[in-house]
């Protein structure tokens, strides 16, 4: 290379060099017809109007008009890579999943890292949880472990998810990020305290994607070959070491290199610095689950490592960059309901909600046959079922095989060995209010025992620096919640807010105007 820069910057140069011996391809239309002139449209005379028969133009333009697909409603901004999972420790006593079959076994994987709230063009260095989703291409179909870089989440009931995400995204009138929305929701739902505390700690802004841990977060169920089941949590710890960005560096990078995370990952892999993560499980027996002091399926809580130690399983290694971002990263679709035999869902309400939501949003974003897209295709298993047709059916549509079941013609048969683990439930069927399921004990342990004095100081500064832009009544609700975690937590934030509030004039009222006909008489009287 004449002017050697980093591999990401030199991608086109590298592509050209790889093809140095080849003659340039013949330019074609989408249908493969050769194109004679790609620089000038057909017109009647040099200044005349265009002709509809200029299919070179219309083919190009029509395709361009349809280039964009809907961005993900959450986790829109992301980076992807490919590699393998290698088993280093035997856990077949817990799970019969083929991915864990024997030590040394390698399974191809695809990974996508992402932020959550930002749009697809947003900065990589914002304070936001990070998605860390892993797709294992196993012989029993794909296993999608759709994790984050935190072991917990803001809510424990999936009915709140749309509202939670709305509160993090843009105000419906101003189209601006709105601290009132963010903190109003968080302050009204104190189960968010654990994740909020993690988010505003030093780990809230990881240094790229290679220096953060991943967690399945939910409780799952593992089932062994004898049909015995345990509950489990998945952890994947970075072998590169945890590194975070300071608030100042993150702000600078969001200006200078908003794609910092994508660039860092691409360049590391392109230069042979393959990032890896050590994969662990925590295991809890059904008996232990009965006596666990909290609901073991509560996504706002962790399982203490001293009681449920990490059990090593294997390594995740990323050694290939995407050949094409749209094909392999934008179109990749992770779905927590993709679980091969040996791995099952627990009663975790958030997981149960995601089992529906994820494939549902993929059908909207990519179409009903999104599993035909090569990056999503379970290519190490033979797909044989009774699903047919639909938009963008991209394979042979299973040929002439019967499309109904049962049938008498030797079409795919059910496998009793793949039956789900059976479990007995009994209980009242109703909407259970979990709002007050101990929202502070584990947060207090995090604040007092996990963080040191300097980290606590930065946590409070980070929170106050964001919370200051919310209205005072919302600030008070939030501080009350933090105070319930620990008096010093709330009062430290309040001391910082006092300074902000004293120095900054506050607009106490946000304008919301509705046409008069929609207003009740009582509301009209107050105008």
């Amino acid at each position: 290379m004449a002017d050697s820069r980093d591999p990401a910057s030199d991608q086109m140069q590298h592509w050209k060099e790889q093809r140095a011996a080849q003659k340039a391809d013949v330019l074609t239309t989408g249908a493969g017809n050769p194109v004679g002139d790609k620089l000038n449209v057909i017109t009647v005379g040099p200044r005349g109007p265009l002709l509809v028969q200029d299919v070179v133009f219309t083919d190009e333009m029509a395709h361009f008009d349809r280039e964009r697909i809907p961005e993900r409603v959450v986790h829109a901004k992301g980076a992807g890579a490919f590699g393998y999972f290698e088993v280093t420790h035997d856990i077949t006593k817990y799970s019969k999943a083929k991915v864990f079959e024997h030590i040394g076994k390698k399974t191809p994987i695809a990974v996508r890292f992402s932020t959550v709230a930002g749009e697809s063009g947003s900065a990589d260095t914002v304070r936001d949880p990070r998605g860390f989703a892993v797709k294992f291409y196993t012989e029993d179909g794909n296993w999608d472990l759709v994790g984050n870089n935190t072991p917990i989440f803001f809510i424990r009931d999936p009915i709140l998810f749309p509202s939670f995400i709305h509160s993090q995204k843009r105000n419906p009138q101003t189209h601006l990020k709105d601290p009132d929305m963010v903190w109003d929701f968080w302050s009204l739902r104190p189960e968010s305290l654990h994740q909020v505390s993690f988010l505003f700690s030093d780990r809230g802004i990881p240094d790229g994607h290679r220096h953060m841990n991943g967690y399945g977060s939910h409780t799952f169920k593992l089932v062994n070959a004898n049909g015995e089941a345990v509950y489990c949590k998945f952890h994947y710890k970075t072998d590169q070491g945890i590194k975070n960005l300071s608030v100042e560096d993150a702000a600078r990078l969001s200006q200078e290199d908003p794609d910092y995370g994508i660039r860092d990952l691409f360049n590391a892999i392109a230069t042979g610095k393959y990032p890896s993560w050590t994969f662990y499980i925590q295991v809890m027996t059904f008996n232990q689950a009965e006596t666990f002091p909290f609901n073991p399926f509560d996504l706002t809580k962790v399982w203490p490592h001293k009681d449920y130690p990490l059990i090593p399983v294997g390594k995740l290694v990323l050694n290939r960059n995407p050949v094409n971002y749209f094909a392999e990263v934008e179109q990749i679709a992770f779905d927590p309901s993709n679980m091969p035999p040996g791995i099952e869902a627990s009663p975790d309400k958030m997981l149960q909600g995601r089992l529906f939501a994820y494939p549902d949003t993929h059908r909207h974003r990519l179409g009903p046959n999104y599993l035909h897209i090569p990056v999503n295709c379970p290519y190490r298993a033979r797909v044989a079922n009774y699903q047919r047709d639909g938009p963008m059916c991209m394979q042979d549509n299973q040929g002439g095989a019967p499309n109904y079941y049962p049938n008498s013609f030797g079409a795919p048969e059910q496998q009793p060995s793949a039956l789900e683990h059976s479990i007995q439930y009994s209980g009242e069927v109703r909407r259970f209010n979990t709002a007050n399921d101990d929202n502070v004990t584990q947060v207090r342990a995090f604040y007092v025992n996990v963080l040191n004095e300097e980290q606590r100081k930065r946590l409070c500064e980070n929170i106050a620096g964001h919370l200051k832009d919310a209205q005072i009544f919302i600030q008070k609700k939030a501080v009350k919640n933090f105070t319930e975690v620990h008096p010093d937590y709330g009062s430290h934030i309040q001391a910082l807010l006092d300074k902000y509030n004293a120095e900054k004039p506050k607009n106490a009222i946000h304008t919301f105007v509705q046409s008069g006909s929609h207003l009740a008489a009582r509301e009209k009287a107050n105008l």
């Epitope: 100081k457 409070c460 005072i472 600030q475 008070k476 501080v479 105070t483 008096p487 010093d488 709330g490 009062s491 430290h492 309040q494 001391a495 807010l497 006092d498 509030n501 004293a502 004039p505 506050k506």
Partner: nanobody, 117 residues
Framework: EVQLVESGGGLVQPGGSLRLSCAVS????????MRWGRQAPGKGLEWVSS???????TYADSVKGRFTISRDNAKNLVYLQMNSLKPEDTAVYYC???????????QGQGTQVTVSS
């Protein structure tokens, strides 16, 4: 009933020092941030300093480096050590708890500080 009783004010020359105290009762003292504010004649209540239960403190830029807030959680007391006093520090000083809100009314009866030669 919450009670805040400020004391320690007085007349002092420019460059001098005073130590204000605030005795607190009626709520769980070691759960809340405490603060000092002041009100000069004809002006609104101005925030001076706040302190967390653990002793973390913040200050208005006008007093930073001269004033020090502290608290004794065992005795339910808050202090404001004021050094290098200036004539513009002349005001009634009030103790407060919880959030400072611009334009609020003072919570206690206050203690007068006059800096004059």
């Amino acid at each position: 009933e919450v009670q805040l009783v400020e004391s320690g004010g007085g007349l002092v020359q420019p460059g001098g020092s005073l130590r204000l105290s605030c005795a607190v009762s009626g709520f769980i003292f070691n759960t809340y941030s405490m603060r000092w504010g002041r009100q000069a004649p004809g002006k609104g209540l101005e925030w001076v300093s706040s302190i967390s239960t653990g002793g973390y403190s913040t200050y208005a830029d006008s007093v930073k480096g001269r004033f020090t807030i502290s608290r004794d959680n065992a005795k339910n007391l808050v202090y404001l050590q004021m050094n290098s006093l200036k004539p513009e520090d002349t005001a009634v000083y009030y103790c407060g708890w919880g959030a400072f809100v611009r334009g609020e009314r003072p919570q206690g009866q206050g203690t007068q500080v006059t800096v004059s030669s």
